[in-house]
Interface confidence: medium
């Protein structure tokens, strides 16, 4: 007996071929011998089976001796043995219909779990193997679970159901809701405008929710809410913003914040949270701000950085086109009695300059005594 696997909701075509390449009488019946459909000349006739409105054939193929049974919008309970009677012969086809669904929404927050459930006909013993978009394979029986979803799990999951050495493939689109980057760092000179961007790693038709940016300044003892906002159908509206600093927020996605100027008292790290409508949990993105200041006070040239810097970062002071006068893995360096010229303060990581501030040191002239 021929075995055909079908997918719930899909259309299946069971073939039945006569030796004569012409239109002759045929009937399709189920295992209870209830007529599903057949022909009367070139007319399609239907029997009293429960498939009535979902069963069809291809009349255009009959005169080639092909008498298919088409079953639309397959259901698990359509799993049965179907018999085609043609030319005093009986052709039996066993149809097994499977369904594979994500037990929750297919839009899941980063870190959440995905469970896939297989619906199968009684008496079947299928095995399932799924491959994630990042190539990870998981195997199971009736259910498959993946905990701690990552951004790379977004995309099409391909699941193969194996039964009677036949296989049927399901494709499930999973969207992991997350920011494109878990963390980012912005390096700015004192006084410069600061742009923070929080691009999302997914696109959906309608996006509604609310968010907040909490900020822990390096100099402050506690964190502070800098801004709260609403998101309605991808439109951003500010609900509340602090007076110092007074952040500006873009009205469209991606979420975009502007700090009018980088100041040492703002250096630190923030956490932007986004709560999406109808989702439990929140999306998070960490953002860090490092601020550099170069100053000359009397005979002292100083360069300082504030904010979350890694211990391996190097801070240097050098006269333009010369070797560094001072280089330290510290957050402040200085030179006493600097030569006149253009001095550069550099913050670098393994030779790569992250932040640079220039300061001009003027020559010192001895003032002549007035008569």
């Amino acid at each position: 007996k021929k075995v055909v696997l079908g997918k719930k909701g899909d259309t299946v075509e069971l073939t039945c071929t006569a030796s004569q390449k012409k239109s002759i009488q045929f009937h399709w019946k189920n295992s209870n011998q209830i007529k599903i459909l057949g022909n009367q000349g070139s007319f399609l006739t239907k029997g009293p089976s429960k498939l009535n409105d979902r069963a069809d054939s291809r009349r255009s193929l009959w005169d080639q001796g092909n008498f298919p049974l088409i079953i639309k919008n397959l259901k698990i309970e359509d799993s049965d043995t179907y018999i085609c009677e043609v030319e005093d012969q009986k052709e039996e086809v066993q149809l097994l219909v499977f369904g594979l669904t994500a037990n929750s929404d297919t839009h899941l927050l980063q870190g959440q779990s995905l469970t896939l459930t297989l619906e199968s006909p009684p008496g079947s013993s299928p095995s399932v193997q799924c491959r994630s978009p990042r190539g990870k394979n998981i195997q199971g029986g009736k259910t498959l679970s993946v905990s701690q979803l990552e951004l790379q799990d977004s995309g099409t999951w391909t699941c193969t159901v194996l039964q009677n050495q036949k296989k049927v493939e399901f494709k499930i689109d999973i969207v992991v809701l997350a920011f494109q980057k878990a963390s980012s760092i912005v390096y700015k000179k004192e006084g410069e405008q600061v742009e923070f961007s929080f691009p999302l790693a997914f696109t959906v038709e309608k996006l509604t929710g609310s968010g907040e940016l909490w900020w822990q300044a390096e100099r402050a003892s506690s964190s502070k809410s800098w801004i709260t906002f609403d998101l309605k159908n991808k439109e951003v509206s500010v609900k509340r913003v602090t007076q110092d600093p007074k952040l500006q927020m873009g009205k469209k996605l991606p979420l975009h914040l502007t700090l009018p100027q980088a100041l040492p008292q703002y250096a630190g790290s923030g956490n932007l949270t986004l709560a999406l409508e109808a989702k439990t949990g929140k999306l998070h993105q960490e953002v860090n701000l490092v601020v550099m200041r170069a100053t000359q006070l009397q005979k002292n040239l100083t360069c300082e950085v504030w904010g979350p810097t890694s211990p391996k970062l190097m801070l240097s002071l050098k006269l333009e086109n010369k070797e560094a006068k001072v280089s330290k893995r510290e957050k402040a360096v200085w030179v006493l009695n600097p030569e006149a010229g253009m001095w550069q303060c550099l913050l670098s990581d393994s030779g790569q300059v992250l932040l640079e501030s220039n300061i001009k040191v003027l020559p010192t002239w001895s003032t002549p005594v007035q008569p």
Epitope: E13, T15, T17, K22, S23, Q40, G41, S42, F43, R58, R59, S60, L61, D63, Q64, N66, P68
Partner: antibody, heavy 117, light 110 residues
Framework: EVQLVQSGGGVVQPGRSLRLSCSSS????????INWVRQAPGKGLEWVAE????????YYNEKFKDRFTISRNDSKNTLFLQMDSLRPEDTGVYFC???????????WGQGTPVTVS | ESVLTQPPSASGTPGQRVTISCKAS??????????MNWYQQLPGMAPKLLIY???NLESGVPTRFSGSKSGTSASLAISGLEAEDESDYYC?????????FGTGTKVTVL
């Protein structure tokens, strides 16, 4: 040799009827499905209807099923296309055709012109 | 119903290879077979079957005609174009009711 010979076309006034004939030879008439295909002036091909000569039942393009009818004369191996309530847009060349090895129309009549004016 | 779209015209010089495409709005395959056919129609004549089941040459048709299919698109190729090949060409599907023909392509030999 398979042959399909057509007759019966002509000029007719709108609302009137016309009967086209398709006479076959060189094959067992009852073993094959015969189709009718039409072509409006300067236009493409359009399938009209087909008949299962063995059972005598016919199937029509939805566009024509209310006005066109297929009948046959088995003793003369001839098929007829009865066209009623003709309209100016029915003007064109009408062909009868039979399938070959595959489902393509391998054998065609010479075509008969119909003008509704 | 299945809609078949063809380019309105194609041309080539004698000896050249000309290809005509036919894009179907849905699949025309059944149980491993492709129900796509190609016809040539000379002015004032009945159509002539060239290719059946996408790639099979009808008997008596010159071997310079060939057919192929990929997905829902079929192609008719004429290699070594000859003056007598100047004609209208139609694709046709017989997979589902009603059988439908393509929009037709006029091939001109320059």
């Amino acid at each position: 040799e398979v042959q399909l010979v057509q007759s019966g076309g002509g000029v007719v006034q709108p609302g009137r009827s016309l009967r086209l004939s398709c006479s076959s030879s060189g094959f067992i008439f009852s073993d094959y499905v015969i189709n009718w295909v039409r072509q409006a002036p300067g236009k493409g091909l359009e399938w009209v209807a087909e008949t299962y000569t063995g059972s005598g039942s016919s199937y029509y393009n939805e566009k024509f099923k209310d006005r066109f009818t297929i009948s046959r004369n088995d003793s003369k191996n001839t098929l007829f296309l009865q066209m009623d309530s003709l309209r100016p847009e029915d003007t064109g060349v009408y062909f009868c055709a039979r399938r070959g090895k595959g489902t393509g129309f391998a054998f065609w009549g010479q075509g008969t012109p119909v003008t509704v004016s | 119903e299945s809609v078949l779209t063809q380019p309105p015209s194609a041309s080539g010089t004698p000896g050249q290879r000309v290809t005509i495409s036919c894009k179907a709005s849905q699949s025309v395959d059944y149980d491993g077979d492709s129900y796509m056919n190609w016809y040539q129609q000379l002015p004032g004549m009945a159509p002539k079957l060239l290719i059946y089941a996408a790639s099979n040459l009808e008997s008596g048709v010159p071997t310079r005609f060939s057919g192929s299919k990929s997905g829902t698109s079929a192609s008719l190729a004429i290699s070594g174009l000859e003056a007598e090949d100047e004609s209208d060409y139609y694709c046709q599907q017989s997979y589902e009711d009603p059988p439908t023909f393509g929009t037709g392509t006029k091939v001109t030999v320059l």
